[in-house]
Interface confidence: medium
């Protein structure tokens, strides 16, 4: 006699100031009447009231007046809840209560998360380094939730356990700063990594910081930039670092600087006969002027695009020459996938439905992953394509074809294979026969 | 190098707003948070709150909302720090820091706010 | 908030002499995230020691730092006259951070 009432299993995962929607259906009997439901959402531990609907209206939020429920779907058992501008202090079970002739009810949990920041790297002391010194390396990374997980790593991949402390710290949002500190003896050169892991969005943030340390006297003028590609993001500033040591007396007046693109040698900016050239790169490109007399030689590249990508060379003339390549890898990270399944309605088992996963703006050509509920692997009957816009970002479109059994998950998670990004969507299908979506 | 530009005085009225500048050169203005820190004469250091130029995201303490209000501009790389409802309790050193790691390696001047009609 | 005590407020010394100075925190705090600043008259507050016993960029080796969880202590082997400034311990492992009241280093 009770009244069916579904929701997700899995948590509802939500960022941190976005809407989420609550899924929550009953399946009205024919002749049902909004006049015969009385429907209730609440905070499951405390039994707070959060959303109501009775007597034939909505009887509004209780919940800081940020929810609101499907008003023209609440007829065809649609009593999903729509929560607005989530907060960290939302997270929880929420229950929705489905009273009409009969009673049921159901609990559906929310997952809060916020992606934290790429983390900065900062290194004391920072000059005159030798092997053999101890220095301390920091790694921040802020404004994420929940707390993160951190993992150092040596420039072979090996991991660094010992002399690391990290420290996570709520602010009155209740995101997370981190910071992570790791203490290491210098040898002749090495490269430090520091990953910062979000585990419910599953996506890595990292940064590395490659020291050398004091240059060995010879004839060239040594020049210096990071061994590993800088990574940028499109739309953002980046800093394509070059370093130089500059010898007593050096005076800005002897120096030529020149950075080109590495294959077609096309110029990009200049310093020569005491004083900045300017860009010859689309007036995006800078140095920093007031860095050059210690020998910081950086370019820094304004409002990256896709087109940027690729080798600069860093050119430094003094009396003697030297000359480096850093690679500037460019990335998008892919939004969250939207999942729509056709056909959509009055589906039953045996039934061949289509599920296609769309994922957008992203670069560089992301990794298409489709599994089960269970994790298995879906690899037959899918097909996935990539569609580069004028800027050259990609949208992904993935397609799998499935026979539905009684029930079943299907997940689909695109991977930025340059940011170690993953952005999943997953769509259950229950009951039979049923329709989807269950939500706006 | 570091440097941290900041005008040398405001004299305000009593129950006046001011906002103080505070000018970032020498490193990646958007990378990394500014602080604010007061100084009343003869006293100790107290942390207002910080502002992550980049996000916009900012961490006060508890004792200075609605005191303070933290802003950016990214085109100058330029923090600010707009101080109301001045009384006497307010006039102080202001300084602003920028840690690059949990440290404040870099001080601004600071500016001396007096408060007086 | 996590407070922390520092004490002496102030401290009369001869050049020459060994001073201690400590920081005591409310609540444990890691060492890594425990820092000092100088600060002299009339000029804003210096970068010293970072995490607990690290001396900043060009601070004097008769500088030192010790501690861990809630006992800090920053100690000079030999006062020299341009020692002479306040002192401020800070910690930066929960929100709000907080500083010292500071220790006033004198010199006779």
């Known amino acids: 006699g009770a009244l069916e009432v579904q929701v997700p299993e899995d948590p509802v995962v939500a960022l941190v100031g976005t809407d989420a929607t609550l899924c929550c259906s009953f399946s009205p009997e024919p002749g049902f009447s909004l006049a015969q439901l009385n429907l209730i959402w609440q905070l499951t531990d405390t039994k707070q009231l959060v959303h109501s609907f009775a007597e034939g209206q909505d009887q509004g939020s209780a919940y800081a007046n940020r929810t609101a429920l499907f008003p023209d779907l609440l007829a065809q058992g649609n009593a999903s809840l729509r929560l607005q501008r989530v907060r960290v202090a939302d997270e929880g079970s929420f229950t929705c209560f489905v009273s009409i002739r009969d009673f049921g009810s159901a609990a559906v949990s929310l997952q809060v998360a916020a992606p934290y920041s790429k983390p900065s790297m900062t290194l004391e002391p920072n000059k005159d380094l030798r092997p053999g010194d101890t220095v301390t390396i920091t790694c921040s990374s802020y404004q994420g939730y929940p707390e993160a997980e951190v993992f150092w790593q040596d420039g072979q991949g090996v991991p660094l356990t010992g002399n690391v402390t990290t420290s996570q710290m709520a602010n009155e949002q209740g995101l997370f700063d981190v910071h992570s500190i790791l203490r290491v003896v210098l040898g002749a050169n090495g490269t430090y990594s520091c990953l910062v892991r979000n585990p419910v969005l599953q996506q890595d943030a990292h940064s590395s910081v490659t020291i050398t340390p004091q240059r060995s006297p010879t004839g060239a003028v040594e020049v210096q930039v990071p061994e590993d590609p800088v990574v940028a993001l499109v739309g953002t500033d980046a800093t394509l670092r070059c370093s130089f040591s500059p010898e007593p007396g050096f005076s800005l007046a002897q120096l030529n600087l020149i950075w080109q693109l590495t294959d077609t040698k096309q110029l990009v900016h200049s310093f020569t006969e005491g004083r900045d050239q300017g860009s010859a790169y689309a007036n995006r490109t800078a140095l920093f002027p007031d860095l050059l007399a210690q020998g910081n030689a950086s370019l820094r590249l304004q409002r990256v695009r896709v087109a940027d990508e690729g080798s600069f060379t860093c050119f430094v003339s003094i009396r003697d020459f030297g000359s480096a390549a850093v690679s500037l890898q460019v990335a998008a990270p892919y939004s969250k996938p939207s999942m729509t399944l056709e056909p959509n309605k009055d589906l039953r088992p045996g039934d061949t439905v289509t599920i296609t996963c769309s994922s957008y703006r992203g670069y560089p050509e992301a990794e298409v992953f489709w599994q089960d509920g269970q994790g298995v692997p879906l690899t037959g009957n899918v097909t996935t394509s990539q569609m580069a816009n004028e800027q050259g970002l990609f949208d992904v479109h993935s397609v799998l074809r499935v026979v539905l059994g009684a029930n079943g998950t299907y997940s689909c998670l695109v991977r930025n294979p340059v940011l170690q990004q993953d952005a999943h969507g997953s769509v259950t299908i229950t009951g039979q026969p049923m329709t989807f979506p269950p939500e706006a | 190098q570091v440097q941290l530009q900041q005008p040398g005085a405001e004299l305000v009225k009593p129950g006046a707003s001011v906002k103080l500048s505070c000018k970032a050169s020498g490193y990646t203005f958007t990378s990394y948070w500014m602080h604010w820190v007061k100084q009343r004469p003869g006293q100790g250091l107290e942390w207002i709150g910080m502002i992550h130029p980049n996000s916009g995201g900012t961490n006060y303490n508890e004792k200075f909302k609605g005191k303070g209000t933290l802003t950016v501009d990214k085109s100058s790389s330029t923090a600010y720090m707009q101080l109301s409802s001045l009384t006497s309790d307010d006039s102080a050193v202001y300084y602003c820091?920028?840690?690059?790691?949990?440290?404040?390696?870099?001080w601004g001047q600071g500016t001396l706010v007096t408060v007086s009609a | 908030e996590n407070v922390l005590t520092q004490s002496p407020a102030i401290m009369s010394v001869s050049p020459g002499e060994k001073v201690t100075m400590t920081c005591r925190a409310s609540s444990s705090v890691s060492s890594s995230y425990l820092h000092w600043y100088q600060q002299k008259s009339g000029a804003s507050p210096k970068f010293w020691i970072y995490?607990?016993?690290n001396l900043a960029s060009g601070v004097p080796a008769r500088f030192s730092g010790s501690g861990s969880g809630t006992s800090y202590s920053l100690t000079i082997s030999s006062v020299e006259a341009e020692d002479a400034a306040t002192y401020y311990c800070?910690?930066?492992?929960?929100?709000?951070?907080?500083f010292g009241a500071g220790t006033k280093l004198e010199l006779r």
């Open positions: 820091v920028t840690s690059q790691a949990t440290w404040f390696a870099y």
């Open positions: 995490s607990t016993s």
């Open positions: 800070q910690h930066y492992s929960g929100y709000p951070l907080t």
